[in-house]
């Protein structure tokens, strides 16, 4: 049902779900603290282009009765019991920063008449692709798949001379959230990548993937999965691999590879590591007492999402226009704002844009070095290290069907 | 182990400037808001300004808007506050801090502190 939003008069509320069940395990406190930082600066910034207004959050939390998993599998009902618990204290703001988790922010999004803009930190997923008033402040799978493919078919680069259409996806249902829906867009049949590739199997149990290393029998040479370093270590140990094998690790939101004094372990040297350019927030984790510094990217997102909201309403404010308008909620979309670390663009549907980055581990110096970038913005990528040292025959990436090695 | 070190202060007249600079040591200074706090003989410490760690925000108290400017240079490890257009009630211990955000930097939420520095404005 429609419900009134404390959003006119020169005082503008943001409503912070804060659900028990989220993408990441981040303290409720740290995010409050993003949030409250986001408040401070979108003030400093509204008074100084001269509107003297007040922004305030209230933060919705939920009771943690019922849904009490704390991932984001009891999630679906929690997003509509909090926005209950808003609808009934008729306490809606102007944005709705809140829901990280797909199946949360897929049913709100579905079951309610938003006719307000909603902010996630997260929402991986591809059911929460296009949604029109939906804003999603993390790298979607889309965004991976969209890499992947591009990825794939590059033949031109000195280290990368073939097409690839084949690829085993490992995805064994432990995935932190990210993850899941990460590879849970790569099997889903009808997806681009599904699409674009001639073959793809899912290999669900540790020895499927233990067995594929040195299978002289293998359909690909290619095998993604998602996690950290140590995830693949528990997975692979120090088993032989193939030579031919290249395994994809996508780990975004871990920054732990451009840290200083950082050693790629002997068992790295097969794979490529897909992660997210730092940027400015590069840190070294032994100066971070207990407060980690916001290599927290879902911190970081909640932040960015209260500058957004802050950076549209001074847009609809100079402009003289209403901000409980369908206009405003369909606005956040195709625009670049001042984020807290630097600019930060979305797409036409509202999704972030950003720079990923593919490292290799270097066999002369054992260090992490970056073999390309690429735009998700413009959909390409910019090889960076033209000669890199692989463990890869004659330097360069073998082809992904057995046999046919490196030309 | 995480060191602050302040420089620039000393005796001026009223109406004149001075620019106070921060040396950070000891902790990954991109990763954290910088600011500036005084220190009036006999009462509280009082937050001044601050700066994200991008430094593309800055936010400052009323006492402090338009005459006093706050930045950083993440390469060199250094924050620096220019004060412009000195009164005598500006006359205090000038202390830089760290933390993770502006927000609870003004909190004194898990602040690093420097010794500080003695800025005395003469009229």
């Known amino acids: 049902s429609q419900v009134s939003q404390n959003c006119h008069n020169g005082s503008y509320e943001i409503s912070v779900l804060m659900m028990g069940n989220s993408a990441f395990a981040e303290p409720l406190k740290n995010l409050e603290d993003a949030v409250n930082e986001g408040l401070e600066i979108v003030r400093g910034r509204l008074q100084n282009a001269g509107l003297n207004v007040t922004v305030n959050a209230t933060f919705m939390y939920s009771d943690g009765l019922i849904h009490n998993s704390g991932d984001c599998r009891s999630s679906t009902c929690e997003g509509l019991d909090l926005l209950r618990k808003i609808s009934n204290a008729q306490r809606m703001g102007c944005v709705l920063i809140g829901p990280s988790c797909t199946y949360s922010t897929f049913q709100m999004y579905l079951d309610t008449e938003l006719s307000y803009p909603m902010i996630s930190a997260g929402s991986f997923g591809l059911s929460c692709d296009y949604k029109e008033t939906l804003t999603r402040l993390m790298s979607p799978a889309r965004k991976l798949m969209y890499f992947l493919v591009n990825f794939w078919k590059t033949n031109d680069l000195p280290f990368k001379t073939y097409s690839w259409s084949t690829s085993y996806v490992y995805k064994n249902g432990t995935e932190t959230e990210d993850c899941f829906w990460y590879l849970n867009a790569l099997e889903a049949s009808v997806s681009y990548f599904s699409h674009e590739l001639g073959f793809k199997v899912v290999l669900r149990q540790d020895k499927e993937f233990q067995d594929i290393l040195m299978d002289h029998n293998r359909k690909s040479n290619v095998i993604i999965m998602c996690g950290g370093p140590e995830f693949l270590y528990k997975l692979k140990g120090d088993r032989a691999v193939a030579e031919d094998i290249v395994i994809i690790l996508v780990d975004l939101f871990n920054d732990q590879y451009f840290e200083d004094n950082v050693t790629a372990p002997d068992y790295m040297k097969n794979v490529l590591v897909l992660t997210l350019s730092p940027g400015n927030s590069l840190l070294n984790s032994s100066f971070s007492r207990n407060l980690s510094p916001t290599k927290r990217d879902f911190a970081l997102a909640y932040l960015n999402g209260i500058l957004l909201f802050g950076h549209m309403l001074k847009i609809f404010l100079e402009n003289g226009e209403n901000i409980t308008t369908p206009k405003f909620a369909h606005a956040f979309r195709n625009l670049t704002f001042e984020g807290y670390d630097g600019p930060v663009t979305l797409d036409d549907w509202g999704d972030v844009d950003s720079t990923m980055v593919l490292l290799y581990t270097s066999v002369d110096t054992k260090k992490y070095k970056v073999l390309l970038t690429y735009d998700t913005h413009v959909n390409k990528t910019y090889p960076v290290d033209m000669s890199p040292t692989f463990t890869w025959k004659n330097s360069k990436l073998p082809n992904d069907i057995t046999g046919r090695g490196p030309q | 182990q995480v060191q602050l070190q302040e420089s620039g202060g000393g005796l001026v007249q009223a109406g004149g400037s001075l620019r106070l600079s921060c040396l950070a040591s000891?902790?990954?200074?991109?990763?954290?808001?910088m600011g500036w706090f005084r220190q009036a003989p006999g009462k509280e410490r009082e937050w001044v300004s601050c700066?994200?760690?991008?430094?593309?925000?800055?936010l400052y108290a009323d006492s402090a808007k338009g005459r006093f400017a706050i930045s950083r240079d993440n390469a060199k490890n250094t924050l620096y506050l220019q004060m412009n257009s000195l009164k005598p009630e500006d006359t205090a211990m000038y202390y830089c801090?760290?933390?993770?955000?502006?927000?609870?930097?003004?909190?004194?939420?898990?602040?690093?502190w420097g010794q500080g520095t003695q800025v005395t404005v003469s009229s």
């Open positions: 700066v994200t760690r991008s430094g593309g925000d800055t």
């Open positions: 801090a760290a933390a993770l955000f502006c927000a609870n930097l003004r909190r004194n939420k898990d602040n690093y």
């Open positions: 000891g902790l990954a200074f991109p990763s954290y808001a």
